[in-house]
Structure formats: structure tokens, C-alpha cells
Interface confidence: low
């Protein structure tokens, strides 16, 4: 990295958790002094170019489309900027996960799915037939990799004390430590509703 420049960003325009055969758009922050931006995937500590964009005078942040997502395209991505013939800058890294490589786990809750703020709920992710060593709990609509992870089987995810932001649709995924970017099909969905008005009617769906 050159001098004290802030590290350029790299981002996915949609969720980085991508179903098999799905697509995602990746954006590299444009930097003024770069004449070429390359999107690289890092596999086994080696870089492989996925795409490149030459700089134009009216350039916005360069975008790259990854389509037909599969096991080979899952992993860590980084933008590489050419400043001169032998000078480079690099962005932060972005992790993309592909789903649909194993059978789906089952997600259940230890209580009803309509909660008041401050209450607790535990969601359990289990897989009777596939011995996953990791599970991730994802909330629909979030644009980052799920923060909730567990190495237990079954996996217990404690949410709470909850606030209104916890409301949403949740699914879990199973995966293996040895292949951290290859995830199962999503589990059944559970919709959590956090409300400070218990008098409303709420229906939850699977």
C-alpha cells in the first residue's frame, strides 16, 4: 500500500451470499492516479484476474459483474490499481460465498416468533444428515456476510435482548471449515417480529 493513502473500498452491490448460478455486481472505488483497475480473486495466496477497466476521463467507480456463480468463483476478491508500470495499490478485500452446494439445514426457535423489545430468543440450526462443522445465520436483505456463526452442532444463535431492528426473515446455512466459501442451500425461513404493540395481529410464515 502506497504511503498513508486510505485503503480504497470494494463492495458488492447486492448480498455477498450468492446462490449457485446467480450473479453479483462488484464495485471498486475509483482512484485518481490509477490508469487501470483490475478485479482479482485470491486463491491459495495467488491472484487471478477476473476483469479489468481502463480509466476514462469521466470514470465513475468501476463495476464488474460476476455471473454464473459457482464454487470456483467463491472466495476473496480485491481490486488492484496500476499506478505506473511497476506500482500498484490494493483495495480492502471482499468475501463472496456461493450457496446450494449441500443439503439445507433446519432452523427452529425456542419460543414464539413475535417478541417485545428487550426479550430474548434462541434460534437453532441443525442438520441430521450432513455433518457440517460450521453454521451461519443470515437475515434477509443484509448486504454483508452474516455475523452470526457457530461451530457447534446443532448451532444455537441467541438473539437478544432484541430491539425493533431484529425484525426480519432469518435463514441458516451449513458449511465446512475447509471450504468456508461453499455453503449449503438456505434452511427454511423464520420471520421474527419485534413489536412494542402486542395488540396487533401478526402472522408468521415458514
Amino acid at each position: 500500500q502506497e504511503g498513508d493513502f486510505p485503503m480504497p473500498f470494494i463492495s458488492a452491490k447486492s448480498s455477498p451470499v450468492i446462490p449457485l448460478d446467480g450473479s453479483v455486481k462488484i464495485q471498486c472505488q475509483a482512484i485518481r492516479e490509477a490508469y487501470l483497475t483490475q478485479l482479482m480473486i485470491i486463491k491459495n495466496s495467488t491472484y487471478r484476474e477476473i476483469g479489468r477497466r481502463l480509466k476514462f476521463w469521466n470514470e465513475t467507480d468501476p463495476e464488474f459483474v460476476i455471473d454464473h456463480m459457482d464454487a470456483n468463483k467463491a472466495g476473496r476478491y480485491q481490486c488492484q490499481y496500476r499506478i505506473g508500470h511497476y506500482r500498484f495499490r490494493y483495495s480492502d478485500t471482499l468475501e463472496l460465498v456461493v450457496t446450494g452446494l449441500y443439503g439445507k439445514p433446519f432452523l427452529s426457535a425456542d419460543r414464539g416468533l413475535v417478541l417485545m423489545p428487550g426479550e430474548n430468543i434462541s434460534l437453532t440450526c441443525s442438520s441430521a444428515h450432513i455433518p457440517f462443522d460450521r453454521f451461519s445465520l443470515a437475515k434477509e436483505g443484509e448486504l454483508s456476510l452474516p455475523q452470526h456463526q457457530s461451530g457447534e452442532h446443532p448451532a444455537n444463535f441467541s438473539l437478544g435482548p432484541v430491539d425493533l431492528n431484529v425484525s426480519g426473515i432469518y435463514r441458516c446455512y451449513g458449511w465446512y471449515n475447509r471450504s468456508p466459501y461453499l455453503w449449503s442451500f438456505p434452511s427454511n425461513a423464520l420471520e421474527l417480529v419485534v413489536t412494542d404493540s402486542i395488540h396487533q395481529d401478526y402472522t408468521t410464515q415458514n
Epitope: 459457482d70 464454487a71 452446494l101 449441500y102 443439503g103 461453499l182
Partner: antibody, heavy 116, light 107 residues
Amino acid sequence: RVQLKESGPGLVAPSQSLSITCTVSGFSLTSYGVHWVRQPPGKGLEWLGIIWAGGSTSYNSALMSRLSISKDNSKSQVFLKMNSLQTDDTAMYYCARDHYDLFAYWGQGTLVTVSA
Amino acid sequence: DILMTQSPSSMSVSLGDTVSITCHASQDISRNIGWLQQKPGKSFKGLIYHGTNLEDGVPSRFSGSGSGADYSLTISSLESEDFADYYCVQYAQFPRTFGGGTKLEIK
């Protein structure tokens, strides 16, 4: 074009083991799972098991003790091995590519007859 | 294991007819059902997954519906190539289990 082709021995003696190979093309075994299904003559379909893209397996528990599924990603081949065959294991054996946890593309099948 | 009861086991129909085949699961399978077609002398082909989604290349005259434990496959304006065997299959649980099949014959 997605294709699957089973190759098996045709005839197996009772108590012997069965080995069938499913050779695939048009897709990678690192991205898709492959199921095995069989259909005895004049009877319904029975799911045997699957080897997932990531390499783990799931089996029909009724057959689990006699069944083994493996693969060679580089050769695009999936292998079904079944031990201690009896006459009621006579069936068409099919491999099928997984799609959204189901079966989208199937092989033509290979007929296995268990007989002395 | 989940039992899939498919009906009818066979039906005689005419070109241009609309037909429905039903499958009842022994428990709620939350639309984790697919439909398969097997033409005479040929292998199987996936038609529908997740209850209602058509596989690539499947004509729009095929449609799936249902929820809970009851599902149906409807073929509108039958064409000659549609005379075949049809099977439902559930994938809510292991092991995957199939309906007994429905044979569509020309009247």
C-alpha cells in the same frame, strides 16, 4: 449441454457387490451434487443418496449400511457401490444432477439384474 | 419417511384437454416438491421445483400449485409429446420420496 451416463455390470450374482459409474459432462462436480435413484421393474422410484458438490454424502437410511457414494471431480465421475445384493435389488439405476435440492437432469439409466 | 400419495395412477385423455395430477404428502412439506416426466423409452426430466417453478425449457402449459401437504401438476392444452409418466417427489426431508406415478394415455 448437461449429460449424465451410467455404466454398470448388467448382471450381478446374489450376495455380490455392485459398482456403477456415472460420467457427467456439461457441468462441474465441484458445483453440483449428483443423486442416485433406482426403479425396480414395474415399481416406483427409490432415492438412494447424493454426493454433494462439496464432497459430503447423504444416504437413504434404509440402505445406508450397504451403500457408498464417491466421486472423482477431475474425471467428472461419480461412483455408486452397493454390497450384499439380493434379487429385490434388480432395478434400473439412475444418476441425476442436483438442482435446487432436486433432480433436473437424469442419465438414461443402467439395468442391473441380480440373478444366479 | 414422508409418504407421497399420487393420484390418479393413470388417465386417458384427449389432445387439447387440461389435466391435473395431485400428490398428497403425509405431512406439511412447505412446497418442497418437484414434478418429473418420463416419456416412453426415455429417461426422466425435471419439470417443476419448489412447487411452482418451471425448470429451464419447460413449456408454460405446465404449472404447479399447492401448499401444506397437497399439491397438483396441471397441463393445459395437452400436446402429443405430453403423453408420458409423471411423478411427484418431496425434498422436505431425507430420504427423498416419490409418488407412485401417473400414466397419461391417449383416449
